[in-house]
Amino acid sequence: MAVTACQGLGFVVSLIGIAGIIAATCMDQWSTQDLYNNPVTAVFNYQGLWRSCVRESSGFTECRGYFTLLGLPAMLQAVRALMIVGIVLGAIGLLVSIFALKCIRIGSMEDSAKANMTLTSGIMFIVSGLCAIAGVSVFANMLVTNFWMSTANMYTGMGGMVQTVQTRYTFGAALFVGWVAGGLTLIGGVMMCIACRGLAPEETNYKAVSYHASGHSVAYKPGGFKASTGFGSNTKNKKIYDGGARTEDEVQSYPSKHDYV
């Protein structure tokens, strides 16, 4: 029963996690304009993996896709790749885990097959979660680097009275969604792997031994008994990502005072 519960919970947690990874990948708010220096901007910029957007005071929002592959930063391409790999692995993992669920009977599938499928999906979820966490972390690192670089160059190119103020970007909502979703997928994968241990039949086969007693011959042939390992209750859920950076503007509860201007 505990094994079924662990497997089912692992599946549900992974499902939520993968849905979150998909949502994060599609979201436009991977980076949002830092409003520390200008909290009353009339034009609010934010960027995703696929397009950059502007929300105006007028209420009008316009987005422009990145219609180039070669012109994009290698890091952005890497993040895209990591997120897509995470989604693909997660989706395959979900498909495999559906058939592996103990509560679902498909033909005469043996427990050993289900155990293998559970382990496979678990590993896929773990890798999927790690891909998402890695992708989001790479993007966050890129943001931090660019943030401090643009802070250092904030008023470069001041010719006379003309200031070219660079738009600085900070963490967007998608980063937090991605971190949480990646963490959930990872936890779900670990749970599936734990469930696999409970499903796997540990067969101890004793060879048939003949005892020749006086009078008549009796053959004792004990069948292989199944030793079921109990569900380890001491498994610790590790915190994948602690908090993360928060900006003064507490990015993005749409519309927030500062970003909707």
Partner: antibody
Framework: EVQLLESGGGLVQPGGSLRLSCAAS????????MSWVRQAPGKGLEWVAT????????YYADSVKGRFTISRDNSKNTLYLQMNSLRAEDTAVYYC???????????WGQGTLVTVSS | DIVMTQSPDSLAVSLGERVTMNCKSS????????????LSWYQQKPGQPPKLLFY???TRESGVPDRFSGSGSGTDFTLTISSVQAEDVAVYYC?????????FGQGTKLEIK
């Protein structure tokens, strides 16, 4: 046809108060950000205040901050500008405007004259 | 605050002549999000409220004759009238739409010789 009609202007003494209204018609008022812009006699245009769709957020020119309050009543399709502690330099024609793409002001009312004088 | 400076303050031209007026901002009005310049141009005829001519620096408002054109990017912008007509006599204002406070240029007065 889009129409913006200002009212409430007039002669007021320094330190006095006045409330301007702008009746909007011909468009979905609640879906637009609205602004007030003023023009002193023989002078250029000066942005005064803006109120965002929904009315939650308001922005003011430094010259009027703390004295003027922009508000809106979407049920009445009306924009307001409450002007307190009026000064001689607030004398101007006050225009009610609608913001569109690019934060540009596509429609302007005919304006209402506010004269602050003793 | 972003300071908008227009030049010249006034100009007198003959009918049919090409005219150019400039607007300079103290900060870039180019948005990185959509690569649009947040500057608008207005025409104000005597005794009338201003009329929007261009937004996003070069996007013509509907109903504006195509003899008017807007151009420029970053901090330098231009309004051009290819062939001035009598009805173009007005004061032309540029406006920063990028950040609060919205600021207008002091205006360029166009007259006919």
């Amino acid at each position: 046809e889009v129409q913006l009609l200002e009212s409430g202007g007039g002669l007021v003494q320094p330190g006095g108060s006045l409330r301007l209204s702008c009746a909007a018609s011909g468009f979905t008022f609640s879906s637009y950000t609205m602004s007030w812009v003023r023009q002193a006699p023989g002078k250029g245009l000066e942005w005064v205040a803006t109120i965002i769709i929904g009315g939650s957020y308001t922005y003011y020119a430094d010259s009027v901050k703390g004295r003027f309050t922009i508000s809106r009543d979407n049920s009445k399709n009306t924009l307001y500008l409450q002007m307190n502690s009026l000064r001689a330099e607030d004398t101007a024609v006050y225009y009610c405007t609608r913001l569109v793409k690019g934060n540009a002001m596509d429609y302007w009312g005919q304006g209402t004259l506010v004269t602050v004088s003793s | 605050d972003i300071v908008m400076t227009q030049s010249p303050d006034s100009l007198a031209v003959s009918l049919g002549e090409r005219v150019t007026m400039n607007c300079k901002s103290s900060q870039s009005l180019l948005s990185s999000g959509n690569q649009k310049n947040y500057l608008s141009w207005y025409q104000q005829k005597p005794g009338q409220p201003p009329k929007l001519l261009f937004y996003w620096a070069s996007t013509r408002e509907s109903g504006v004759p195509d003899r008017f054109s807007g151009s420029g990017s970053g901090t330098d912008f231009t309004l051009t009238i290819s062939s001035v007509q009598a009805e173009d006599v007005a004061v032309y204002y540029c406006q920063n739409d990028y950040s609060y406070p919205f600021t207008f240029g002091q205006g360029t007065k166009l007259e006919i010789k």
